[in-house]
């Protein structure tokens, strides 16, 4: 029967108010405390116990169905009896210095036995010995600088790089390509120590013995290294370890800046190529290879004994069935596994998800179901390469590609306490802007003002005056499989630091033993007002996506984004005007497709305004066009060399998994093209990638046309 739209809207906004009002800072704090009592490393008993606890609590909160979804995936652990370390050895082979085997436990955690020592997950075993070369952040451009400008070879050397700027897996890949035989990663004070702030436990800075753990894979969206493309279940065919996807080929190990000081202080060779290579240690940052002067006979030796093991992991999947469109899924997911206590990553996110589930459950118990089905997920093994989310999505890919409306990610709720940070598909820009206008800002000096107001003032958009910044989705988190592989509209939100004044990479204690509950309570968010704001943003996004009669997606924002990305990639190409002319490279077709998309999107929006929302078939048709628009940007063949990155508009940068790149196929074809041996072949590939992008944009536009 026809619904009364006015009443519908009242109940929608009333229900939303009720949902948001139910979210409590005190509960988030309580949940965070509960989730951070012990380490929750993927594949361990502790993390299985937490999965069962979350399963039981979600059932109590009122979800219709909660299940544990398990997979047997490749994980990596240090050898308990044979610890990893790095030493300096003299000409007689005697160790004259050894890096520390573990971090000093934080106060109150001295008796917790299952803290995993710092290690680089998936490093192969090995004991390479040789001269050190300092490679800055080990970015592509750093190796270009070293090899091409400074004529320094890393072949057969052990390289040492400072964490920051890019994903550590990319650093290792670059070192391998440069011929290094081992790699040391360290946290430099310039990147992980903010001036005038004390070290933990007296402040939120990284102490000299603090170390960042992390995986060093280059999976490119594959999931479990042994079962790429398919779920790692009982029936799965597993590759041999020699054919596993993305494993590094050289030993890798992380250290803190106290140990790095000892390795770097006597480095020889030339000075750094420019001052951007200088960190915050009292060392010259000479590049090497090897040590200088009297120390030149000393070598560095790595001792890495970690091992890989197929291990069972557990996702928790909760379902709240939709009242009217149960076959349309809105997913809220975040991971549960942590390197140690996970005070920020992931439990500040998991605690928010828990409270959002509780609030939706409270509404359901009062008879207020969402219009669409909401799926809640507590992912396992995110730290080992986004494994839990990817395996689950692989198992349910056919359902997800047909029924998936949106995925909202919920890892760490905070990485600072300055302002909001949002990365999402352009389809969600309007949704995010609108809902932040309705939420209170938690920021000092913005009392009585909206979150939108404080956000736009503190983080203005570089393109659109008077609007806040929203960034592209990259990867390094559990939205990857949903967005980059399946083409499900995705978004993420968290509170962040002031990037203008605070130059540190991530937050200083990231992935260290010092990422505790106390860190959050004492230094980041004592009242949990920022956690509450993030819960409101994430919760409101899910609420709107699950309850709006018309999906809150704006295809015109995508049109604007496509135009910007086409301009950007054209400008990159035009740095080679002679070659563009010689090889007859034209972007006319791409601009034409973008213009067409813009025109079609505008007409679609006009029809949407005129839609009879009481006609369920017409409503479903237009909602499906909106839902499937993101899907239309998926190329089944994937990107060159990266079959699981299938989105033609966005992909994780080939040089930094964390960063998003637009028109990645064209971008990669153009990258460093002037040094390619076969110029004709290289420019031909640019041409091919332009044609793929053109076809994709044109095909996506077609999906928005009137259906008949």
């Amino acid at each position: 029967k026809p619904s009364n739209e006015a009443t519908g809207n009242v109940s929608h906004s009333g229900m939303k108010k009720e949902f948001l009002h139910e979210l409590k800072a005190e509960n988030i704090k309580k949940f965070l405390y509960n989730f951070t009592r012990t380490p929750h490393l993927a594949g361990t008993q502790n993390n299985f116990e937490l999965a069962k606890q979350i399963h039981d609590q979600w059932k109590e909160f009122g979800l219709d169905l909660v299940e544990l979804s398990h997979y047997d995936v490749l994980l990596s652990y240090p050898n308990k009896t044979h610890p990893n370390y790095i030493s300096i050895i003299n000409e007689d082979g005697n160790e004259i210095f050894k890096t520390s085997l573990s971090e000093q436990p934080p106060p109150g955690y001295e008796n917790i036995s299952d803290v995993v020592p710092p290690y680089s997950a998936f490093s192969p075993q090995g004991t390479p010995e040789g001269d050190l070369v300092y490679v800055n952040y080990a970015r592509t451009e750093d190796f270009f600088k070293l090899e091409r400008e400074m004529k320094i070879s890393c072949s057969g050397k052990i390289v040492i790089a400072r964490y920051g700027k890019v994903f550590r897996g990319n650093m290792v890949k670059n070192a391998q390509l440069a011929g290094a035989k081992g790699m040391i990663l360290y946290s430099d004070p310039a990147d992980y120590f903010v001036p005038a702030v004390k070290s933990y436990p007296d402040g939120w800075n990284l102490p000299g013995g603090g170390v960042q753990r992390g995986n060093v894979l280059n999976l490119n969206g594959a999931g479990d290294p042994l079962t790429p493309g398919y779920p790692a279940n009982e029936h799965a065919y597993r590759h041999e370890l020699t054919n596993a996807v993305g494993l590094p080929s050289i030993p890798v190990h992380p250290i803190g800046y106290d140990d790095a000081q000892k390795l770097l202080e006597h480095m020889g060779g030339p000075a750094p190529p420019d001052s951007s290579w200088k960190g915050g240690l009292k060392v010259p940052y000479n590049v090497g290879p090897g040590f200088a002067g009297n120390f030149s006979t000393q070598k560095v030796k790595m001792h890495i004994h970690s091992y890989t093991k197929v291990t069972r992991i557990y996702n928790v999947i909760g379902t709240l069935k939709g009242a009217l469109e149960p076959d349309r899924y809105v997913i809220l997911g975040g991971h549960r596994d942590a390197w140690v206590f996970g005070g920020i990553d992931p439990q500040s996110g998991a605690a928010v998800v828990h409270e959002i589930v509780r609030s939706f459950g409270t509404l359901k118990k009062k008879g207020r179901r969402p219009r669409r089905t909401i799926l809640f997920a507590s992912w396992d093994a995110e730290e080992f390469g986004l494994l839990g989310s990817t395996e689950w999505a692989e198992e349910h890919s056919r359902l997800l590609q047909e029924r998936g409306v949106a995925y909202i990610n919920a890892d760490s709720s905070i990485e600072g306490n300055y302002t909001l940070r949002v990365d999402c598909t352009p389809l969600m820009y309007s949704l995010v802007y609108n809902l932040t206008k309705e939420l209170q800002s938690p920021d000092e000096g913005f009392e009585g003002k909206s979150l939108y107001d404080s956000w736009k003032e503190k983080s203005p958009s570089p393109e659109f005056i008077g609007m806040p910044r929203i960034s592209k989705l990259g990867s390094g988190n559990d939205f990857e499989v949903f967005f980059q592989r399946l083409g499900i509209a995705s978004g993420r939100a968290r509170y962040t630091k002031n990037w203008k004044t605070n130059k540190v990479s991530s937050y200083p204690l990231y992935h260290s033993v010092y990422e505790t509950y106390e860190l959050v309570v004492k230094f980041y968010d004592p009242t949990f007002k920022y956690h509450l704001t993030v819960a409101q943003v994430r919760g409101a996004m899910v609420f709107e996506l699950a309850n709006s009669i018309v999906l809150p997606f704006d295809c015109q924002s995508y049109a604007v984004a496509l135009k910007k990305y086409a301009d950007t990639i054209y400008n990159i190409s035009m740095k080679h005007p002679q070659e563009m002319k010689a090889y007859m490279i034209s972007f006319d077709s791409l601009f034409s497709a973008v213009n067409n998309f813009t025109d079609v999107a505008s007409k679609f929006n006009q029809r949407l305004q005129e839609l009879d929302k009481s006609n369920p078939i017409l409503l479903r048709i237009m909602n499906d066009q909106l839902m499937y628009l993101e899907r239309a940007f998926i190329d089944p063949l994937g990107l060159p060399g990266r079959p699981f990155y299938r989105h033609i508009i966005y992909a994780p940068s080939s040089h930094n998994k964390y960063a998003g790149e637009s028109f990645p196929g064209i971008y990669d074809a153009l990258f460093d093209i002037s040094s390619k041996v076969n110029a004709s072949k290289a420019w031909n590939e640019v041409k091919r990638q332009i044609s793929i992008a053109t076809f994709t944009v044109q095909a996506a536009a077609e999906t928005l046309r009137e259906v008949a």
Epitope: E149, M150, K151, I152, G268, G269, P270, A271, P272, P273, D274, S275, P284, Y285, N286, V287, A292, G293
Partner: antibody
């Protein structure tokens, strides 16, 4: 003691390449751990760092000159040289070869200077 | 680039008067600052490095101070042979290494 001596043509035509050589006496390049460079002085712009070399072949160029500049080192002759392409009247200056303070202190202060050679760019 | 600004442009003193020459950096250069003296027809000569360390053979009447962005070269009791142009130079940030425009000191 260590001495530096610049040599090269005093007059260069516009659009041509300026080439200067600095001969080092009293110190070995390849084992010293010092950095060797060039500085020029014009009445208009004062002292301007051009670039620096290390014996390993590492080079450090002033970005404003990088596209036109090449630095070379010949350890067997104890010489290092500068080539600046496409010169204009603005490149008229006294050119000094210099040594950075050291050894092993990187791109530090300049503790040793040649006496300088005037190069005029004119047709 | 880090801009180095020296003041005053010219300083005229009588022998024995304390000379204070200033140098300001457009951003912090820590203590990576040097002072040079240049007499007419000669190459510059290193006086001070590390903001305050005298180079070998430099008389004790020359002293340097400062850190970050503000630096001072002091000549406690100048002699007539100290008449010269004095330059500061930063080597914290490169490329490029940069010099100040100079202060001309005249000892009457």
């Amino acid at each position: 003691q260590v001495q530096l001596q610049e040599s090269g043509p005093g007059l260069v035509k516009p659009s041509e390449t300026l080439s200067l050589t600095c001969t080092v006496s009293g110190a070995s390049f390849s084992s010293s751990g010092y950095y060797w460079g060039w500085i020029r002085q014009t009445p208009g712009k004062g002292l301007e760092w051009i670039g620096t070399m290390f014996y390993s072949g590492a080079t450090y160029y002033n970005p404003s000159l990088k596209s036109r500049l090449s630095l070379y080192m010949d350890t067997s002759k104890q010489e290092f040289s500068l080539r600046l392409a496409s010169v204009t009247a603005a490149d008229t200056a006294v050119y000094y070869c210099v040594r950075h303070r050291g050894p092993d202190t990187g791109l530090d202060a300049f503790d040793l200077w040649g006496q300088g050679t005037l190069v005029t760019v004119s047709s | 680039d880090v801009e180095m600004t020296q003041s005053p442009a010219t300083l005229s003193l009588s022998p024995g008067d304390r000379a204070t020459l200033s140098c300001r950096a457009s951003q912090s250069v820590s203590s990576d600052l040097a002072w040079y003296q240049q007499k007419p027809g000669q190459a510059p000569r290193l006086l001070i490095y590390g903001a305050s360390t005298r180079a070998p053979g430099i008389p004790a009447r020359f002293s340097g101070s400062g850190t970050g962005t503000e630096f001072t070269l002091t000549i406690s009791s100048p002699k007539s042979e100290d008449s010269a142009v004095y330059y500061c130079q930063q080597y914290n940030y490169w490329p490029p290494l940069t010099f100040g425009g100079g202060t001309k000191l005249e000892i009457k």
